[in-house]
Amino acid sequence: QLTTESMPFNVAEGKEVLLLVHNLPQQLFGYSWYKGERVDGNRQIVGYAIGTQQATPGPANSGRETIYPNASLLIQNVTQNDTGFYTLQVIKSDLVNEEATGQFHVYPELPKPSISSNNSNPVEDKDAVAFTCEPETQDTTYLWWINNQSLPVSPRLQLSNGNRTLTLLSVTRNDTGPYECEIQNPVSANRSDPVTLNVTYGPDTPTISPSDTYYRPGANLSLSCYAASNPPAQYSWLINGTFQQSTQELFIPNITVNNSGSYTCHANNSVTGCNRTTVKTIIVTELSPVVAKPQIKASKTTVTGDKDSVNLTCSTNDTGISIRWFFKNQSLPSSERMKLSQGNTTLSINPVKREDAGTYWCEVFNPISKNQSDPIMLNVNYNALPQENGLSPG
């Protein structure tokens, strides 16, 4: 049976298509191609006569069609108007005609798409953004990419308009992109340039650094404030509620005790209209803001009860500190037998009794800091008494 085949079936605009003919009968007068699904003289593209070995253009010939002696039809520089059905009529020597119909589809060579946006500066957690892939073309598939990945499943991402529009509901600062759209049809594909979203957000709660609270007199106080914000936040400082300056950093040289107080960083985003503050307490003191860990030592750690005494010593290099002692989580001294001396550096127990056995530690502290020693274990033994059974030798 006479058949036709389009090579290719899907043709890019401007390219060529060949309508191949299979099972062409023998003993022919000639053949003709027509545009459409039936033989219509007004829509003849070309005819070919075996007797003259020559083709004759028909009324529907555009100058882009060529017939081959094997009856195949070549159409060059195709347009979308060429899409459709084509009918071959074969005139046989017995004057019985045969017909076969084929078809092909012409698709445009797609241009480089571009992304348009209804809001290029959305506000976080407030605005939605709709991206549209341009241009709108027929028989085209639209795809979207975020950070070079296909769209994740998210209730905040919605596709509409035949996937040509991507809507981000309630944008977040993590939605900056980049975004790309890709258009595809059976003959071509093209991707847009990336588009990034300028999400306006913040300020978040500011952070004041460094984290130090205690400073010595004569030091320089240098505080820096940062709050995540887009556009970047505008900063101002208040000390004890009084405005100081509108800068991100606050610097006070050669501080004194009078510079102690509450330091407030105020961050403002003029676009979102939001403000956030953080308060930090600064203490200027001679006292060491960090007390070193003290060392505890015992004159002996195993003693004989009711007989021996023991001295426990708490050592520290810090000055301006106080010392206190603990035994089994109880504050000492707890009996007449316990004495503190040398500014509480030494704890003496005389005599040691059974109930004094256990864990001891000392703590050094000043008004702004404290530190504990490692614990030390005191063991109390009793010598065995001679046996008293009332019997005399003999």
Partner: antibody, heavy 118, light 113 residues
Amino acid sequence: QVQLVQSGSELKKPGASVKVSCKASGYTFTNYGVNWVRQAPGQGLEWMGWINTNTGNPTYVQGFTGRFVFSLDTSVTTAYLHISSLKAEDTAVYFCARKGIWGPFDHWGQGTLVTVSS
Amino acid sequence: DIVMTQSPDSLAVSLGERATINCKSSQSVLYSSNNRLYLAWYQQRPGQPPKLLIYWASTRESGVPDRFSGSGSGTDFTLTISSLQAEDVAVYYCQQYYSNPWTFGGGTKVEIK
């Protein structure tokens, strides 16, 4: 690529015969007709006729009947021009040319000079 | 038979200049059913076989430089070389293939001035 290669020059006496060959290559020989064109010295082109390579049917232009015969050997994809009873006025370059799909001659042989002289 | 008449017989043109060759047919070669003009132009360089330049009066054969163009109506035709090059020195022939016998014009020789 399409090529038509003709046989070499011939020098003949009046009354003799000559057979010019035209060997085709680079395409399906039986799909395209072969034309014969004469060009007398210093003159223009004169179409002599053609042969249908599919059916073997020749067509002769008036003035080129009788002594001129077109033939084929499809097994060797070759067309022939046979001229008998040569006359001095047959002296010319004879070209074979392929009939293009639309008619005009899209490929030509290099030509064969036939000189008829006593 | 349709008679094809070319003019001029010869033409001398400076390099880079335009050359225009005319061809007239004794009857129309326009086929009304497809609105095509059955006229071709050939170039024959010295010592060479002819070469097809144009068919349908104005369609350039594949590989022919675009300085060659054809135009015409039912009986009057023109071949134009827009900017003559040295390799364009040749004899140019028109041919009608509308009706048997197909006939050639007498040729126009183009030379460099």
